[in-house]
């Protein structure tokens, strides 16, 4: 039995309206999403705030059933979609090889006992590749220009600081030469030695840190934040709900 992590995306996160006041559960969905033609997308819903037992989850398009995950029977994919639809992650559904015709409403329907049926709605817009490519063509040079600007600024700062320190070092060398000779056993601080805190070498490294490590930490935080529950999928489709 595989354990899959249920990803609930922040963008477009919303609560679906419920059919009855007696039903306490809420469905969170990915809301309105867009994807590139030929690409893939994960449709996700999450039922929370109810102790009802989930017996089946349906994934439906406007006029057809895409897939079902039944507590007893496991996953079943529509024969029409078996080449383009993959179950999971979790109780979600992955749509592959997207076409413009895939644009439209998608529904996740949770069949529960004793509450009844909870429905979530997701609107998917599939964009032509050229739209995404145009965006990329615009963004890449922009990022390149920003990076180049940072490099130039940082290089200039390094040069200025290095020259300033060299001048200081020369002055110190000429005025206090004998003091340096007395402390010859101590490590000299020169531009070639490791830079102290606050120097431009660290500042130069900062853009890489911000664009690399920092972003990675952000991603890890988001990953940890949204992957709060794990779901058993495929096999017998065990369902869990969060009662908080």
């Amino acid at each position: 039995m595989r354990w899959c992590l249920l990803l609930i995306w922040a963008q477009g996160l919303r609560q679906a309206p419920l059919a009855s006041g007696m039903m306490t559960g809420t469905i969170e969905t990915t809301g309105n999403i867009s994807a590139e033609k030929g690409g893939s997308i994960i449709l996700q819903c999450h039922l929370s705030s109810t102790t009802a037992q989930v017996t089946q989850v349906n994934w439906e398009q406007q006029d057809q059933l895409l897939a079902i995950c039944n507590a007893d029977l496991g996953w079943h994919i529509s024969p029409s979609f078996k080449d383009r639809v993959a179950p999971g992650p979790g109780l979600g559904l992955t749509l592959q090889s997207l076409t413009v015709n895939d644009t439209g409403e998608y529904f996740c329907i949770y069949h529960t006992y004793p509450d009844g049926t909870y429905t979530g709605r997701i609107f998917l817009e599939v964009l032509e590749s050229s739209v995404a490519e145009h965006g990329a063509r615009f963004q890449i040079p922009l990022l390149g220009a920003m990076a180049a600007t940072l490099v130039v600024i940082c290089t200039a700062v390094i040069v200025v600081v290095a020259l300033t320190r060299k001048k200081k070092a020369l002055r110190i060398h000429s005025v206090e030469g004998d003091l340096r000779r007395k402390s010859a056993g101590q490590e000299e601080w020169s531009p070639s030695a490791p830079s102290p805190p606050g120097s431009c070498v660290q500042a130069e490294a900062a853009p890489a840190g911000l664009c690399g490590e920092q972003r990675g930490e952000d991603c890890a935080e988001l990953h940890d934040y949204f992957n709060v529950l794990s779901y058993r999928s495929l096999g017998n489709c065990s369902f869990f709900t969060e009662t908080g």
């Epitope: 059919a19 089946q56 349906n58 439906e60 006029d63 057809q64 059933l65 079902i68 039944n70 029977l73 079943h76 529509s78 024969p79 029409s80 529904f107 329907i109 069949h111 049926t117 429905t119």
Partner: nanobody, 121 residues
Framework: EVQLVESGGGLVQAGGSLRLSCAAS????????MGWFRQAPGKEREFVAS????????YYADSVKGRFTISADNAKNTVYLQMNSLKPEDTAVYYC??????????????WGQGTQVTVSS
């Protein structure tokens, strides 16, 4: 394959009511929607009403709107057609249909054997 069995047909006077039932069996998890069609003598089979199995959305032919009501009991895998204010032109064989994976409004994959409804004037 999904099997469908209708019941509830019969003879009724104009203005009267009837309730048709259709029980589904087999791999009912694959049902997208269920509904009713009818075929009057010498005419083509026509759509009457349907309901999306899981969401409860309902659709009706203009000729029956306001008089017929379709409903479903998912727990019993049964769909019902409540027919009120019946007219002689409602006389026909009523067929239950199940759209397996796809909507029966596009292609009805499974059919019941039909039940006769006769409205006398």
């Amino acid at each position: 394959e999904v099997q469908l069995v209708e019941s509830g047909g019969g003879l009724v006077q104009a203005g009267g009511s009837l309730r048709l039932s259709c029980a589904a069996s087999g791999p009912t998890f694959s049902i997208y929607d269920m509904g009713w069609f009818r075929q009057a003598p010498g005419k083509e089979r026509e759509f009457v009403a349907s309901t999306i199995w899981s969401r409860g959305d309902t659709y009706y032919a203009d000729s029956v709107k306001g008089r017929f009501t379709i409903s479903a009991d998912n727990a019993k895998n049964t769909v019902y057609l409540q027919m009120n204010s019946l007219k002689p032109e409602d006389t026909a064989v009523y067929y239950c249909a199940a759209g397996v994976w796809s909507s029966l409004r596009h292609t009805a994959a499974n059919w019941g054997q039909g039940t006769q409804v006769t409205v006398s004037s």
